[in-house]
């Protein structure tokens, strides 16, 4: 038995690790699944953050793992992306769903960040240059759309390059190649890693490499 306290928990199951799999919510002592109607990257971001896997990689409309069983607790989940828990997002009501089956169980792929790398290139030192990120084994760039000093601050701190001195777009440090991993990132400047900023999803963009972004950090400026 239990005495009070919140009666809700969240987990990802049947995935490759604790940061991927079928979404399950424990409500009133019972684990159940989430239907994929209206499933979005915003919901995935909330889940990833809640589980301490802060990088939302993708939002499969169904669980890549096996279908769940038991109750379907949530449907038409609608998140802004800044909620602290999945159950703070709007939905149809607990246990209410539109004839969902477990074939529609929602899934999530987050990252714990351990397989991600970042570097600055073509700037003459490690603390200035074009931003490149290694994701799923491939190096790619960041688009300059809405890129600002808050983004640069996150990058410089993450790379232990001091504070941000300046940022640039329009492939100021040359055009990269490969994927363009991020576009229209929203950072407040306090994130511990660039991929913890709000984004539309890895590889989602409307850019080309002529828009690759770059930064100069204080430790890079000192070396110039």
């Amino acid at each position: 038995s239990s005495l009070g306290g919140t009666d809700k928990e969240l987990r990802l199951v049947d995935g490759e690790n604790k940061c991927s799999g079928r979404v399950e919510v424990k409500v009133q002592e019972e684990w159940g699944t989430v239907c994929n109607n209206g499933w979005s990257m915003e919901a995935v971001s909330v889940i990833c953050n809640q589980l301490g896997c802060p990088t939302a990689i993708k939002a499969p409309g169904w669980a890549n793992s096996s279908a769940g069983s038991g109750r379907i607790w949530m449907d038409h989940v609608s998140c802004r992306g800044n909620e602290s828990a999945l159950w703070d997002c709007k939905h149809d009501g607990w246990g209410k769903h539109s004839n969902c089956t477990h074939q529609q169980d929602a899934g999530v792929t987050c990252s714990d960040g351990s397989n991600l790398e970042m570097r600055l290139t073509r700037g003459g030192n490690m603390c200035s240059g074009r931003i490149e990120i290694k994701f799923q084994g491939r190096w790619g760039t960041v688009c300059d759309d809405n890129f600002n000093i808050d983004h640069a601050s996150v990058i410089c701190r993450q790379l232990e390059c001091g504070s941000a001195v300046s940022f640039s777009g329009s492939s100021n440090f040359g055009e990269g190649s490969g994927p363009i991993w991020f576009d229209d990132l929203i950072c407040n400047g306090n994130e511990s890693a660039l991929w913890n900023c709000k984004h539309q999803g890895w590889g989602k963009h409307n850019c080309d490499h002529a828009e690759d972004a770059g930064v100069i950090c204080s430790k890079g400026a000192d070396l110039s």
């Epitope: 919140t6 009666d7 939905h91």
Partner: antibody, heavy 116, light 107 residues
Framework: DVQLQESGPGLVKPSQSLSLTCTVT?????????WNWIRQFPGNKLEWMGY???????NYNPSLKSQISITRDTSKNQFFLQLNSVTTEDTATYYC?????????WGQGTTLTVSS | SVVMTQTPKSLLISIGDRVTITCKAS??????VAWFQQKPGQSPKPLIY???NRYTGVPDRFTGSGYGTDFTFTISSVQAEDLAVYFC?????????FGGGTKLEIK
């Protein structure tokens, strides 16, 4: 349709134990739902006391501490509220209530008076 | 525990009036608020779940809204059969808690 009916002693002396029964018809208490006890004090204040789920797991209001126990008899399709060491403060109308998550189905209530 | 502060405690109304009852939670409870109607000598009847969803058979003159800490229950045009006590309750976290009730009375 789910129907719930409470029954109890009506009058209990202070320091005694109270036992109430909720008899459920039209639905098996092991099929689904949480099976709750809620009481309403004179003056209308409602207090959720606790539940037992269809799988037999219980959850209690911490304000009732070790005073409360909710059990069931699946063969009779009944669940029970036991409240130990009652005081006059436990005078109230007691409702059994059920639903998947929400308080969807309510019994008519049974009035309990604690008095010497 | 989450405290649900319900106002007003009573309302003197005329048939046809628009009535608004508010509930304020002591912390965010997302959309997890329900509203109940209790007529004299009867048990509470659920009207609204998850802040704004009417139960089947509940007339559409009853509406609920709100998110976070502030919630509103409205009867667009009060009928004689609506005279009752109305309660809010939060379903967000255990223990579930209720407002103190609002009694509708005829002027």
């Amino acid at each position: 349709d789910v129907q719930l009916q409470e029954s109890g002693p009506g009058l209990v002396k202070p320091s005694q134990s109270l036992s109430l029964t909720c008899t459920v018809t039209g639905y098996s208490i092991t099929s689904d739902y949480a099976w709750n006890w809620i009481r309403q004090f004179p003056g209308n204040k409602l207090e959720w006391m606790g539940y037992i789920t269809y799988s037999g797991i219980t959850n209690y209001n911490p304000s009732l501490k070790s005073q409360i126990s909710i059990t069931r008899d699946t063969s009779k399709n009944q669940f029970f509220l036991q409240l130990n060491s009652v005081t006059t403060e436990d005078t109230a109308t007691y409702y059994c209530v059920s639903g998947t998550y929400y308080f969807d189905y309510w019994g008519q209530g049974t009035t309990l008076t604690v008095s010497s | 525990s989450v405290v649900m502060t319900q106002t007003p405690k009573s309302l003197l109304i005329s048939i046809g009036d628009r009535v608004t009852i508010t509930c304020k939670a002591s912390q965010s409870v997302s959309s997890d608020v329900a509203w109940f109607q209790q007529k004299p000598g009867q048990s509470p009847k659920p009207l609204i779940y998850y802040a704004s969803n009417r139960y089947t058979g509940v007339p559409d003159r009853f509406t609920g809204s709100g998110y976070g800490t502030d919630f509103t229950f409205t009867i667009s045009s009060v009928q004689a059969e609506d005279l009752a006590v109305y309660f809010c309750g939060q379903d967000y976290t255990s223990p579930r808690t209720f407002g103190g009730g609002t009694k509708l009375e005829i002027k």
